[in-house]
Structure formats: C-alpha cells, structure tokens
Interface confidence: low
C-alpha cells in the first residue's frame, strides 16, 4: 500500500538536489581560494540535516547553524549588494564589477540560488512532489527559513556604504513584505553602516521620472532614517548602459545623456 | 534656504595650482556627502569628486586621480578642492553639489543633484 503523502501547495524539491548542491560547492571551492578548506560532503550533511526528517512547516533558523557555521564566509562589508525584485541585473552587475558581492555570490547564496528542497516528517526521504508555499502552506517551510537565516547574517555583516538594487518597474519600487524589506532592511546595523543608497532601476526608455520621489522610497527612507542611518537614492534611467559604465566610467557615452 | 557659493578659481599656467572652495548654509552640512562637478565649454556635465560625510571616503575621477584632492570642514561646512599640475584639459566651471539623483557615470546636467552652486571658473592656459 503507498504510503500517503501530504500534498503542498508548491513545487517539489529541484530534482538532483544533492547532486546540484554538492557539484555547486565543488565549483565554488575552486574558484574561491579562500574557501578551498571547506569540505562539500560535510556542507551537503549539514544541509541535509536542517531539513531532512523535519516537518516542512516547522524549519527553524537553528537548524540551519551547522550549515552556516561550515559556510562562513569573509566578503568586504563594505562591497556589499543587496537587491529586491531585480536579481538578474544585480548578478550581471557583480560579474562585472568584481569586488561587489550578492548574497548569491558567496557560497551559501550560491549553493541555494533558484533551488526549492524540503523533507519529510519522521522519513529519511526528500519531497520531489511537492513542497509549501510560503503564502499558502507555511512561512517557517526549509527554503523560507534558509534565505531568511542567510539574508539576516548578510546584513548584519555590512558595513559603511551598502546599495540596494530595486525595480522601478514595480508597483512597489520598495516592498515591505520582500526579504529585504522584511529581513534585511532590519539587520543592517547603525553602528557600522553610515548610507543605504538605493539604485532605482527604470524599466521604460523614456521614463525620465525621479523614482526617487516615489512614496515606498520615502517610506524605505523613513525605515533607514529611524535607524540612524542615512539613506540616498539614485535612478538608473538606461538599465541596458549601466553595466557598459560601470565596466568603463570614462567612456564619453556614460557622462553624455544616458 | 540651501546656498553652496564656490571661489577660488581663476586663471592658471599648465602644471599650475588652484584651491577651490564651497562655502554651504541651510542645510546640516556633516550629513552629507559632497561632490565636486565641472562643464567644459561645450562639454557635458563630469563627476570630478565625492567625499563622504566624515571625510574618510573620497573619491576621484581617473584623469584627476594623484592632482586633486577633496576636503571638507564639517565645523565651518565647507568643501574644497585642492588642484595641483592642472592640465588644458581641466579648464572648465566647477560646482559643488550635494544629493545626486544618479550614479556619477548618469550624470547629465545640474538638475540631477538636489542643490547646487553658481560655480567658478578655472581656465589653464599658457
């Protein structure tokens, strides 16, 4: 008899999980120098482990601090990237400029990138079927808890200046319920972190609006301002020429109308 | 009312000095970041300069890189820009500015700051 299996609302586990998860560390490792030390088999145990024979609905950040101790991680605090709704753009940016850093750029972040994984409570077994939604099901499901736990500690390591990446496309430009709104927004510490300087992106050719102006951000900067920390913002009019400046500044078409 | 009134400028032989000057009111100066801004003749707008609030982070264009060097006095809110071995090539009106609307690399003219000044002009010429 088939042993009945609690349906979710979302898509199940990326199929070839552990394989994907233990050939990115791989990878990772050796392009890192500085992470050449990190054993993959121990980083895809203690992966497994804050999940696997769990109750999808009842993850905890503690079940993930094996992982994250095995995965720390050193980036400059002050290079630092977040993005909200824009993930694309931000990763473009940090392959081209090279001493910035996503989350997705160290190797938690990495590892986990675009990946859905949860268990089974009391089996040994990964749920290939089906797996919560964080709006439908549960908030405290494996891959919720994991970008959260991972996001929070990002944060808090910033320092001085940190950017935000936002899209102006977006009826919300800021939105209070993203993970940076919600997480990382609240982790940046005031006694480090001096700006928050959010880049909006435009989506539109002839958008020449001041997004800047729009009512979330100054609802982003009233948050910022309360922390004691200041708070800029920039518009990004022409997405498709912003990597070609940032690649090269000097070039006359980055300081000529853009 | 925001003022940022610059001085200093003036004409100057190639290889040369000058030491501009902004002199801010109306707003809390040390919560700023400041920024330095030149138009050539018949030139677009060009990012020069930017310190930050505390004076510890500054930075420069390429070309300018090792010649100038941007300063601040949070206790008298002024800016300035130390000019050594100026060029033909840095004749132009500079402006202090502050709240850029864009990244340094978009910067299109005076409109994309919050405030600025009326600028002073620096000629080099033999």
């Known amino acids: 008899v088939p042993r009945w299996r609690q349906q979710w609302s979302g898509p199940g586990t990326t199929k070839r999980f552990p394989e994907t998860v233990l050939a990115r560390c791989v990878k990772y490792t050796e392009i890192h120098p500085e992470m050449r030390h990190v054993d993959c088999q121990s980083v895809w145990d203690a992966f497994k482990g804050a999940f696997i024979s769990k109750h999808p609905c009842n993850i905890t950040e503690e079940d993930y601090q094996p992982l994250m101790k095995l995965g720390t991680q050193t980036v400059p605090c002050n290079k630092i990237l977040l993005w909200s709704r824009i993930k694309d753009l931000a990763h473009q940016f940090t392959q081209v400029q090279r001493d910035m850093f996503t989350l997705e750029d160290t190797l938690l972040g990495y590892l986990a990138d675009d990946l859905t994984w949860c268990g089974e409570f009391n089996t040994s077994k990964i749920n290939y079927q089906s797996c919560p939604d964080w709006r439908k099901d549960c908030s405290n499901n494996p891959v919720s808890v994991f970008w959260k736990t991972v996001s929070r500690r990002f944060a808090e390591a910033a320092c001085d200046v940190v950017h935000v990446m936002l899209n102006g496309s977006r009826s919300k430009i800021f939105d209070k319920n993203s993970t940076f709104g919600s997480v990382e927004v609240h982790n940046l510490q005031p006694e480090k972190v001096q700006t928050l300087e959010a880049w909006v992106i435009h989506g539109g050719r002839e958008d020449s609006r001041d997004l800047c102006q729009d009512p979330t951000i100054k609802e982003l900067e009233s948050i910022i301002s309360k922390r004691n920390i200041q708070f800029s913002c920039k518009n990004i009019y022409r997405p498709d020429k912003f990597l070609q400046c940032v690649k090269n500044p000097e070039d006359s078409s980055c300081t000529s109308e853009i | 009312e925001v003022q940022l009134v610059e001085s200093g400028g003036g004409l100057v032989q190639p290889g040369g000095s000058l030491r501009l000057s902004c002199a801010a009111s109306?707003?809390?100066?040390?919560?700023?970041?400041m920024y330095w801004v030149r138009q050539a003749p018949g030139k677009g707008l060009e990012w020069v300069a930017t310190?930050?609030?505390?004076?510890?982070?500054?930075y420069y264009k390429d070309s300018v890189k090792g010649r100038f060097t941007v300063s601040r006095d949070n206790a008298m809110s002024t800016l300035l820009l130390q000019m050594n071995n100026l060029k033909s090539e840095d004749t132009a009106v500079y402006y202090c500015?502050?709240?850029?609307?864009?990244?340094?690399?978009?910067?299109?003219?005076?409109?994309?700051?919050?405030?600025w000044g009326q600028g002073t002009q620096v000629t080099v010429s033999s």
């Open positions: 310190i930050s609030t505390d004076g510890r982070g500054t």
């Open positions: 109306g707003f809390t100066f040390s919560s700023n970041w």
């Open positions: 500015a502050k709240e850029p609307r864009v990244l340094m690399a978009y910067l299109r003219n005076l409109g994309d700051f919050g405030s």
